[in-house]
Interface confidence: low
């Protein structure tokens, strides 16, 4: 049976979803266990004017010592104001000084990056040491690069489309995810549904997705269900500021007692099927419906509070 619920974009003041992911449009992770220099390459595309970017490098201690020296090659297509955090890391940074402006003195060794096309930049970087990771990111707001984490099966890093960078790189896109909403026809009452659909990633290892839900209404005003659907290898850690009905695939737990896993359900894996699920749970409004790439952290901020859906 077709569910009549015309999904339309919801204005950011009604609902906004941000997320952190390891999925990249192009990337690679390789192992270079004996290299003196750990080389990482980031190609960053900023589609609208100058952007601000938070870039954090985190080192994992290996055998009680800090990792080898790191070369980070930063290739950007337009002006970026960079907030760099790389405490205690022996970092060399190669970048285009006419495009990258630091928010504070970087406190690291810097090198001017030649104005080469991508393939030549990779060659230039590889001349300095074997490339551990490379990634192409579109409009990042923040990037976390974990050093000494590379667990790729490749010995040589070659950019490939649609890659999962695993623990090596996580990033947050600047543009929030598209949030849509609709009224479920023929259902009375004020119960609202928030539906999050996480799409399969490019590596199928077990994953926990942390879902932070912040609904700005008084607890007594709210009758809501949170529907989380994802691939079978995804479990959920829920951090919500309201009590609500939970309906998920896989297993889920709550941040307040994460050790207690609760088994979920088998849910449809189509938008239409999930809308049907919301209707079956007596929701009259789908206050937010979001489809995301495989993410590690998802934050939903919504201010619908039953019966007042506004689409943009």
């Amino acid at each position: 049976e077709t569910v009549h619920c015309d999904l339309q974009p919801v204005g950011p003041e009604r609902g906004e979803v941000t997320y952190t992911t390891s999925q990249v449009s192009k990337g690679c992770v390789a192992q270079a266990p004996n290299a003196i220099l750990e080389v990482h390459v980031l190609f960053l595309e900023f589609p609208t004017g100058p952007s601000q970017l938070e870039l954090t490098l985190q080192a994992s201690k290996q055998n009680g010592t800090w990792p080898r020296e790191v070369l980070l090659v930063l290739s950007v297509n337009s002006s970026v104001f960079l907030h760099l955090q790389a405490l205690g890391i022996p970092l060399h940074l190669a970048y285009n000084s006419s495009l990258v402006t630091f928010q504070e003195p970087p406190g690291v060794n810097t090198t001017e990056l030649p104005s080469f096309p991508k393939t030549q930049i990779l060659e230039w970087a590889a001349e300095r040491g074997p490339i551990t990771s490379a990634a192409e990111l579109n409009d990042p707001q923040s990037i976390l690069l974990r050093l000494g984490q590379a667990q790729g099966s490749l010995s040589f890093c070659m950019l490939e489309a649609s890659q999962d960078m695993g623990r090596t790189l996580e990033w947050r896109p600047r543009t929030p995810a598209l949030v849509r909403g609709c009224h479920l026809e023929g259902v009375a009452g004020h119960k609202e549904a928030h539906i999050l659909r996480v799409l399969p990633g490019h590596s199928a290892g077990p994953r926990t997705v942390t879902v932070k839900v912040e609904l700005s209404c008084a607890p007594g005003d709210l009758d809501a269900v949170l529907i989380l659907q994802g691939p079978p290898y995804v479990s959920w850690l829920i951090d919500a500021n309201h009590n609500m009905q939970i309906w998920t695939t896989g297993e889920y737990s709550f941040k307040i007692f994460p050790e207690k896993n609760i088994r979920g359900f088998k849910l449809p894996d189509t938008p239409q099927g999930l809308l049907g699920e919301a209707r079956m749970l007596n929701a009259s409004i789908v206050a937010s419906f979001v489809e995301l790439p495989l993410a590690s952290i998802v934050s939903l901020h919504a201010s619908s509070c039953g019966g007042r859906l506004q689409t943009s």
Partner: antibody, heavy 118, light 106 residues
Framework: EVQLVESGGGLVQPGGSLKLSCAAS????????MDWVRQASGKGLEWVAE??????????YYAESVKGRFTISRDDSKNTVYLQMNSLKTEDTAVYYC?????????WGQGTLVTVSS | EIVLTQSPATLSLSPGERATLSCRAS?????MHWYQQKPGQAPRPWIY???NLASGVPARFSGSGSGTDYTLTISSLEPEDFAVYYC?????????FGGGTKVEIK
Amino acid sequence: EVQLVESGGGLVQPGGSLKLSCAASGFTFSDAWMDWVRQASGKGLEWVAEIRSKASNHATYYAESVKGRFTISRDDSKNTVYLQMNSLKTEDTAVYYCTRWRRFFDSWGQGTLVTVSS
Amino acid sequence: EIVLTQSPATLSLSPGERATLSCRASSSVSYMHWYQQKPGQAPRPWIYATSNLASGVPARFSGSGSGTDYTLTISSLEPEDFAVYYCQQWSSNPLTFGGGTKVEIK
């Protein structure tokens, strides 16, 4: 809903000072880059100053025409951005708009009129 | 600084007509943003990053261009479209606005 409300405009003599305020609501103010843009009567828009977010060390930037005379500041605890205007000139007469930069100026206040005249 | 020149300064057209507003940059820019302003009101974001319509902007508006030449087009003018339109760049410091194009009723 994003709201920006300017205040503090008025009549001041050349060489005098004035402090404009902009009260913000409806978004996470501490993450926002905030700007002042002005418009003289019947003229176009002119960017004046910007203050960035805490993550960007509250860095400030100014148009050449106001550098050394105007100071932009913010109080994240009060969700307010300020423009302290000193050594005012007659050519500073304009409506001053508070605005938020998020890839473009996506939200604007209604403006406050500053008149510099003897 | 990059100077943005908008032409024409005034465009006199009737409802239903097509309007083409031009913004030329003194040197190449990555993107252009456009704002609409009506008398006694604050500017409103209209088109961002050359071709993306801001929230609530009707589909009869479109933006295009690259390098130094950018265009805002209104396919069929409605009464509420008569206003001043400003272009703006920030591919290079400082941020600059164009002088505006006034679209008035003929």
